[in-house]
Each structure stands twice: as structure tokens, then as C-alpha cells.
């Protein structure tokens, strides 16, 4: 049975030109993690595997560093980076556990982090 | 450089068995998960099993299910492919693959072919 | 299963032309989506993986595009190497299904 629960950096904005950082803590399981895949909307951006450590797609390579942890950092942040970006953390034995982020970037400077919250 | 090489493959009747092999060289093998995928004469791919590195977690074909048993060995930087109850549509070339991040095969063997007949 | 559905099954087309191949994905695989070239006796090679990410060693003519159920692999000017049948996979999930396939023969 699954009883892990994701939880999430949630609903973010940043600032266009800035950087962010996804974090996603995986918690309340003992399943071992072999591989964290982060997504936005349809594309890979990266993969965190126990075994082989970071893959960075090579179209995001200028603008997506891995970590801090099993987060990512995006940076050079555009209008078009707005949307959904997604935690698939993949363990053994409990399977996939998904954390959904949605990351607003605003042409101003008043980008506020916004709460934390939890995906069952 | 990267190395994967088949072998165990011949020709078995109906309802027999082979075990075949997929010798690693050139990389951490117990690092990557790892496949197997057959190719019937004159037609397409078709995955038979994959095995994870570290958990070993393994799934198989529907295909094959209940008939073959995908295991590999790290100490030896094997792979294997346990096939039982052979049947003649079982007939096909099988590579191993390697397969980083569980996501694409960059690697492949040459082959090796197996053929059930009577 | 996910079903991939792949076209044409065959094409011919002469060196220097734009050869485009398409593959679809009876569910949305994100971008999970590789393309493998395959000649004669020989075992498939890798060419793209994740939809769009060229495979180290592999000629700049290739590339691939697409995400959700929709992809293409294009070859921007047909070499006499690239002869060959080409082949999409998915790796969403198991079972992993490959296309049926795409012949390339000189016209």
C-alpha cells in the first residue's frame, strides 16, 4: 500500500530574468527512491536516478541546474516558463508518487512565494 | 567502449528451453537498468522484459509472461533471459539493451537467434 | 497497453530530400518517446530520445519534435546511409511498445 504523500514548494511566481527553485520532499514512507523525473506540461527537463545521478535534457541544459537535493533550479526564468511542472518520484516498493508545481512568471517585481501544500 | 554481446541462442523444439545471456563490458553494469527486446523474421521490435538496476524490479511482456524470467548477475556483468515452454512464435532474433534512466535503450547487441521448431 | 501507430509503413525518396516520419501514441506519453534506426541484420541504433534529444554520435540532419500523442522524426537531407527502417518507442510505461515501423528505400 502507498502511504507516502508529496509534498511540494506549490503555487510559485518569480520574477522574468530571475531563477526558482522546484522542490519536491517525498515523506511519511519508507520506499526507497531510485529515480526523481521532473517534467513541465509534456517535457522532460530532468532526471535525478540513485544510480546514474543527474541527466539534464540538452534543451534546457543552459537553463536548468540540478539540485539543490533532488529539486531543480530554473533560471533565466521567461513568460513561457509559466505552467505546470511535475515531481514523479519513482521508489521501490511503493511505485510513482506525483507532485504537481505551478510556477507564475511575472513581468514585475512583486513575485511572491506562495504557501506550501500537500498532494496525498 | 561500450559492449553488449548475446549468446545461448539455437534451435529448440516446442515446449523446450534455453537460457540466454548478455554479456556487459565497458560500463558500471549495476548501474543501468537493462531489456530485452526480439524481433520475429521480417517483422518489428518487440520488448520481452526490463530489469532495474539497484531493485531489480522486473516487468515483463504479456507475451511471456509466466514462461520467462529475466535476471542479471553484477558481479558477472550478466544478464539473462530464462525461456521455458517455448513456443514457435517465440522464434526471433533477442537483443539486450542497455537502458539509462529507464527511458531510452542507447545501447544494443548484435543479436542472437533463436528458433523453435520441431 | 499503449498502442503506437506509425507513417507511412514505407516511403522512398531520393538523397538531399526532407524525409519526415510520424508516430502517434493511443495515450499521451509525454515526452517518452524514442526513435531507433535499424538496417539489415543489424541491431537498431538510437537516434533520439526523449522526443527531441539527439544521441550523442548521431549526424545533426536528424532531429525529433513533438509531446503528449504527436511526434516526428525529420531528416533534413537524406544520406545514402540513411537507408534503412526506422522505429518509434514508447517508455511512459510498461508494457514498452514500439511503432510498427518505417521503411526508407531509394526511389
Known amino acids: 500500500m502507498m502511504t507516502g504523500t508529496i509534498e511540494t514548494t506549490g503555487n510559485i511566481s518569480a520574477e522574468k530574468g530571475g531563477s526558482i527553485i522546484l522542490q519536491c520532499h517525498l515523506s511519511s514512507t519508507t520506499a526507497q527512491v531510485t529515480q526523481v523525473n521532473w517534467e513541465q506540461q509534456d517535457q522532460l527537463l530532468a532526471i535525478c536516478n540513485a544510480d546514474l545521478g543527474w541527466h539534464i535534457s540538452p534543451s534546457f541544459k543552459d537553463r536548468v541546474a540540478p539540485g539543490p537535493g533532488l529539486g531543480l533550479t530554473l533560471q533565466s526564468l521567461t513568460v513561457n516558463d509559466t505552467g505546470e511542472y511535475f515531481c514523479i518520484y519513482h521508489t521501490y516498493p511503493d511505485g510513482t508518487y506525483t507532485g504537481r508545481i505551478f510556477l507564475e512568471v511575472l513581468e514585475s517585481s512583486v513575485a511572491e512565494h506562495g504557501a506550501r501544500f500537500q498532494i496525498p | 567502449e561500450v559492449q553488449l554481446l548475446e549468446s545461448g541462442g539455437g534451435l529448440v523444439q516446442p515446449g523446450g528451453s534455453l537460457r540466454l545471456s548478455c554479456a556487459a563490458s565497458?560500463?558500471?553494469?549495476?548501474?543501468?537498468?537493462m531489456s530485452w527486446v526480439r524481433q520475429a523474421p521480417g517483422k518489428g521490435l518487440e520488448w520481452v522484459a526490463s530489469?532495474?538496476?539497484?531493485?531489480?524490479?522486473?516487468s515483463y511482456a504479456d507475451s511471456v509472461k509466466g514462461r520467462f524470467t529475466i535476471s542479471r548477475d553484477n558481479s558477472k556483468n550478466t544478464l539473462y533471459l530464462q525461456m521455458n515452454s517455448l513456443r514457435a512464435e517465440d522464434t526471433a532474433v533477442y537483443y539486450c539493451?542497455?537502458?539509462?534512466?529507464?527511458?531510452?535503450?542507447?545501447?544494443w547487441g548484435q543479436g542472437t537467434l533463436v528458433t523453435v521448431s520441431s | 497497453d499503449i498502442q503506437m501507430t506509425q507513417s507511412p509503413s514505407s516511403l522512398s525518396a531520393s538523397v538531399g530530400d526532407r524525409v519526415t516520419i510520424t508516430c502517434r501514441a493511443s495515450?499521451?506519453?509525454?515526452?517518452?518517446l524514442n526513435w531507433y534506426q535499424q538496417k539489415p541484420g543489424k541491431a537498431p541504433k538510437l537516434l533520439i530520445y526523449?522526443?527531441?534529444s539527439l544521441q550523442s554520435g548521431v549526424p545533426s540532419r536528424f532531429s525529433g519534435s513533438g509531446s503528449g500523442t504527436d511526434f516526428t522524426l525529420t531528416i533534413s537531407s537524406l544520406q545514402p546511409e540513411d537507408f534503412a527502417t526506422y522505429y518509434c518507442?514508447?517508455?511512459?510505461?510498461?508494457?514498452?511498445?514500439f511503432g510498427g515501423g518505417t521503411k526508407v528505400e531509394i526511389k
Open positions: 518507442q514508447q517508455s511512459y510505461s510498461t508494457p514498452l511498445t
Open positions: 495515450q499521451s506519453i509525454s515526452s517518452y
Open positions: 539493451a542497455r537502458v539509462p534512466y529507464s527511458v531510452w535503450m542507447d545501447y
Open positions: 526523449a522526443a527531441s
Open positions: 565497458g560500463f558500471t553494469f549495476s548501474s543501468y537498468a
Open positions: 530489469i532495474s538496476s539497484s531493485t531489480g524490479t522486473i
